[in-house]
Each structure stands twice: as C-alpha cells, then as structure tokens.
C-alpha cells in the first residue's frame, strides 16, 4: 500500500498541472524509481527547469502573461551553460523576450522571479544596454558576436521564451 | 520651452517623394523615443513611424513600412520622415511627438503644430 | 493590431454636466494592475494634448474635472463638470503593444 498510496499522490499532483499541460514528459532521477521529473510536452528540460519557446509575437508584458498563465515565467538566466542550452533551440533570425526588465529607465535591471541582477552573469551584446526607453531585454543573434542580450521597447511584439521548474512526482 | 516644431509640408504627386523635418528644442533630444503620427481628413489619427533616441532603432506600421523612413540628427536636434512612393491615402496632416515612457507603459506627451501633406495629381 | 473603438462618436452636454465617452479595445490593455490607455483632446487648428495617462494618471496642468477609469479591454474618460472650453475631440490610443492606435475618436458639443 505504500506504492499505492504514491500512486495515488502522483495522479493528484497530475491532476493539478493538467489544466495547462495535459501532457507531461517525465524521466526517471537517478536510480530511485519513485523520483520522476517532468516537464509538459513539448518543453524541453535542463537541469532543474523546462524551458518553452513561444513563437507568437507579443510585447514583452503579454509574453510574461502568456507564461504565467502556463506556471512559468518568461525565461531567468543564471548561467553560460544554461543561455548555451538555450541558443540550440531558437532561430537566428528571431528575437526573444526575457524576464528581464527595467521598468525605472534608470538601469536597475531585475529578474522577473526577484533572481538578483548579478553583472557578472551578463551576456549584453557590446554597447548594449544603450537607451532608457528600451526597458525589457532580448536576446538575440548578431554575426559579429554570436548570441547576446539587447534592450529594446518593451512593446515591441516578439517572441518569447517561458521557463518553469521541472515538476517533481 | 519644450517644443517640437515640423516644416517640409507641401503638394506632391502620387508616386513622388516628400521629406519632412521636426525642430526639438527645450529639452535633451536624445534621450527620448520619437515618433511621427498624422491625421488623416476624416480626422482619424495614425502612428507612421517611431525612432529610439540612440541607435536608431526604428518601428513601421505595414502601412508605410518600405516606403517612409524616420531618422535622426541629434547633434542638430531633428527628427525626419523620407517619404517616397507617396499615394493619394497619405494625404494627412503629419505631427512629430515625443514619447514619454513611465515603468512599461508610455504616451506622446509633446506634440508639434503639425505640417501638411497633400498627395494629389 | 489592437483596435480601439469609442462611443459615442459626438455628444452634446449642458454646462456644468458630465461627459462620459467610452473606449472599448479588441484585447486586453493591462498589465499588473496598470491600464495602458491614454486620452487626449483636441481643439480646431491646434494638435492633439495629452490628458489622461496609463488609464487613471491625469498630466500636470490639466483641470481634475477631467477624469480616467477602466481596465482590461473597457476604459472611460469622464469630464464633470463640462465647461465651455473642453468643446473638442477626444482620442484614446493604447500603448501595450505595437503598432500604437487610436480610436476614432469622439466630438464634444457643449449646449
């Protein structure tokens, strides 16, 4: 009964998540094969998180609705190796919204998850950011630079990119 | 004083070109966004073309995107508008207006006193 | 493109009354509590002058009889009481999402 009763928990948790996601893709952690960890299908997943690329063209307030409304946020970058991960999936000749946003126009850039603005873990593309008006940052591609970040209007439509935790069940 | 003053205005036939100029004074051109907006005869109000205050990244509606082009000397505090390829529909009276942005909402809050387009054979 | 669509498109209004006009949007215009949607007015010969911001926020120098509501897709600019002086046209034009628009604007008669 105890496998029954984990059962059980994982249908609700299911359940839960089923209003936005009916289709989950999960994978075993480990060895332990009661630990799974999903992301909705067709996310793709890195580390702790699932990561989804939207491809509707809207400004950067209605991207950061269009991903809450699914559990996630427009995406937080914390690292190299996660924007790395995350370049394989997007298109060369498209920009995408972050979650990253200076609402003041006074270059105090936060996170939308109140993740701390770290300097450090920047990747603006050189001479970027350049304009107070342009408060919601992109990331995009330049053939000088490869992939970088840029500020632009924030309602100017472009895509977007959403990331959530992975569910555990 | 902040003002916004446009001049370039005139007659033109369809097909010809016109390039129009806005004057900025009273305030530090550029750092704002600027747009150009016109009203047409029936009165009705459309936004032409907008211009980031450095860089020069520049936004079209699909209406004149192609045929106008919004740039800017900010050493000499003018905005301008190319416009080729002109039609009859552009006949409009054309205002500069600056963009006055407050967290992630914005609004024209300075406007000029407007310049006269006329595209007619 | 997010149209705006105001109503009525002229009234008339007694000294000293109120003036409601309208503005609907085909989507929503909002964000964390903030309206995106601004009015203006517009007298014979002269530019369109800013009014109303971010659906609520009245600019520096205009009277507080002129007054912003609404959120979501339905917004209402109200004056009260009307005076001689606000005989004019009045826009509203949302700043959400590109392209900016405007509605059709809506022509105060005072009686």
């Known amino acids: 009964n105890f496998m029954y009763s984990k059962t059980v928990k994982r249908l609700s948790k299911l359940r839960e998540y089923q209003q936005y996601h009916p289709s989950l893709t999960c994978v075993m952690e480990g060895k332990d094969i009661e630990d799974w960890s999903c992301c909705p299908t067709p996310w793709t997943s890195f580390q702790s998180s699932c990561y989804f690329i939207s491809t509707g063209m809207q400004s950067w307030t209605k991207s950061q609705k269009n991903c809450s409304v699914m559990g996630a946020d427009l995406v937080v970058i914390n690292t190299r190796e996660e924007q790395d991960f995350i370049i394989q999936n997007l298109k060369r000749n498209s920009s995408y919204f972050l979650g990253l946003s200076d609402p003041g126009g006074r270059r105090h850039w936060q996170w939308v998850d109140q993740t701390p603005y770290n300097e450090n873990v920047t990747f603006w593309h050189s001479g970027e950011p350049n304009n107070l008006d342009e408060r919601c940052a992109i990331i995009n591609f330049r053939s000088s630079e490869e992939w970088g970040w840029n500020d632009i209007h924030c309602h100017v439509p472009q895509k977007s990119i959403c990331k959530m935790k992975k569910i555990y069940i | 004083e902040v003002k916004l003053v446009e001049s370039g205005g005139g007659l033109v036939k369809p097909g010809g070109s016109l390039k129009l100029s806005c004057a900025a004074s009273g305030f530090t051109f550029s750092s704002y966004t600027m747009s150009w907006v016109r009203q047409t005869p029936e009165k009705r109000l459309e936004w032409v073309a907008y211009?980031?205050?450095?860089?020069?990244?520049?936004y079209y509606p699909d209406s004149v995107k192609g045929r106008f082009t919004i740039s800017r000397d900010n050493a000499r505090n003018t905005l301008y508008l190319q416009m080729s390829s002109l039609r009859s529909e552009d006949t409009a009276m054309f205002y500069c207006?600056?963009?006055?942005?407050?967290?992630?909402?914005?609004?024209?809050?300075?406007w000029g006193a407007g310049t006269t387009v006329t595209v007619s054979s | 493109d997010i149209v705006l669509t105001q109503s009525p498109a002229s009234l008339a209004v007694s000294l000293g009354q109120r003036a409601t006009i309208s503005c609907k949007a085909s989507?929503?215009?909002?964000?964390?509590?903030?309206?995106?949607m601004n009015w203006y007015q517009q007298k014979p010969g002269q530019p369109p002058k800013l009014l109303i911001y971010a659906a609520s926020n009245l600019e520096s120098g205009i009277p507080a009889r002129f007054s912003g509501s609404g959120s979501g897709a339905d917004f209402t600019l109200n004056i009260h009481p009307v005076e001689e002086e606000d005989a004019a046209t009045y826009y509203c034009q949302q700043s959400n999402e590109d392209p900016p628009t405007f509605g059709g604007g809506t022509k105060l008669e005072i009686k």
């Open positions: 207006a600056r963009h006055h942005y407050s967290h992630y909402f914005w609004y024209f809050d300075v």
């Open positions: 211009i980031s205050g450095v860089g020069g990244d520049t």
């Open positions: 989507q929503s215009v909002d964000y964390d509590g903030d309206g995106f």
